[in-house]
Interface confidence: low
């Protein structure tokens, strides 16, 4: 069965920096979302091997990639207090699979010392149901995504 | 308005081979990613293949890989499913859709492919 291998579990990070999220699959894949969880899950960036990415209004200019869609690094740059969250690859193959969450902790520079990554993954309990839709705009859309609904088509 | 028209579909031999034709109309074919499935009488709609929308990568199911061929002619704005070496368990309704993301947002109604044995 097709599985996402996530890394890394946990960053610790300071205001203004970067992290890097990488995913990788065996293969097969139609493409690639990176997903914020939370009470109201946002698709932050889709990724499909020779199409421009699509990014959510709140990271444009802030995300990188490099690889391909079976092996991902998404870099993600200046990272705000807001950022702070877990953010989940899913790929898309003739079912979702999800990756096991990389929970991104964005500090105050002078209070890095009292956030700490522990060493177990993010609880895959925490993922939420596969989506039927996306809510991600064209790359060229300016507009914020508004909440991914249970099914929708897509622009 | 977008259209996915099928054609190409019949009443073949076991071991014979037939070409898919979908026709688009109100979109694109080399700005979505594009897919072929297939329904047989009293079972579930079935993925056969696809081709990315970038054009680089192509999926088949298992079941058919080595005998079909997904390929697309962005100039004609037509997608194709060549079938090979077809099994009487080829035998479905087999129908085009296309996607701008993941999920599948368009759908055509259909061509009938029946293989006797």
């Known amino acids: 069965a097709q599985e996402v291998q996530q890394s890394p579990h946990c960053t610790t990070v300071p205001v203004g920096a970067s992290v890097n999220i990488t995913c990788s699959t065996s293969g097969g894949l139609r493409g690639i979302y990176l997903r914020q969880l939370g009470p109201q899950p946002q698709d932050i960036i889709y990724y499909e091997d020779g199409v421009v990415p699509t990014t959510d209004r709140r990271f444009r200019g802030r995300i990188d990639f490099s690889g391909s869609q079976d092996n991902l690094t998404i870099t993600m740059h200046r990272l705000q207090l807001s950022d702070t969250g877990t953010y989940t690859c899913q790929a898309i193959t003739e079912v979702n699979v999800y990756g096991s969450g990389t929970l991104v902790l964005v500090t105050e520079e002078q209070s890095q010392g009292w956030h700490r990554c522990s060493d177990a993954p993010p609880r895959a309990s925490a993922l939420p149901a596969p989506p039927t839709g996306s809510a991600l705009p064209d790359p060229q859309t300016a507009s914020a995504l508004p909440d991914p609904p249970a099914a929708s088509a897509l622009p | 308005q977008v259209q996915l028209q099928e054609s190409g579909g019949g009443l073949v031999q076991t071991g014979d081979s037939l070409r898919l034709s979908c026709a688009a109309s109100g979109l694109t074919v080399s700005s979505y990613g594009m897919g072929w499935f297939r329904q047989a009488p009293g079972k579930e709609r079935e993925f056969v293949a696809d081709?990315?929308?970038?054009?680089?990568?192509?999926l088949y199911a298992d079941s058919v890989k080595g005998r079909f061929t997904i390929s697309r002619d962005n100039l004609k704005n037509t997608l194709y499913l060549q079938m090979n070496s077809l099994k009487p368990e080829d035998t479905a309704v087999y129908s085009c859709?296309?996607?701008?993301?993941?999920?599948?947002?368009?759908w055509g109604q259909g061509t009938q492919v029946t293989v006797s044995s």
């Open positions: 081709i990315s929308r970038g054009g680089g990568s192509t």
């Open positions: 859709a296309a996607r701008k993301y993941a999920e599948w947002n368009y």
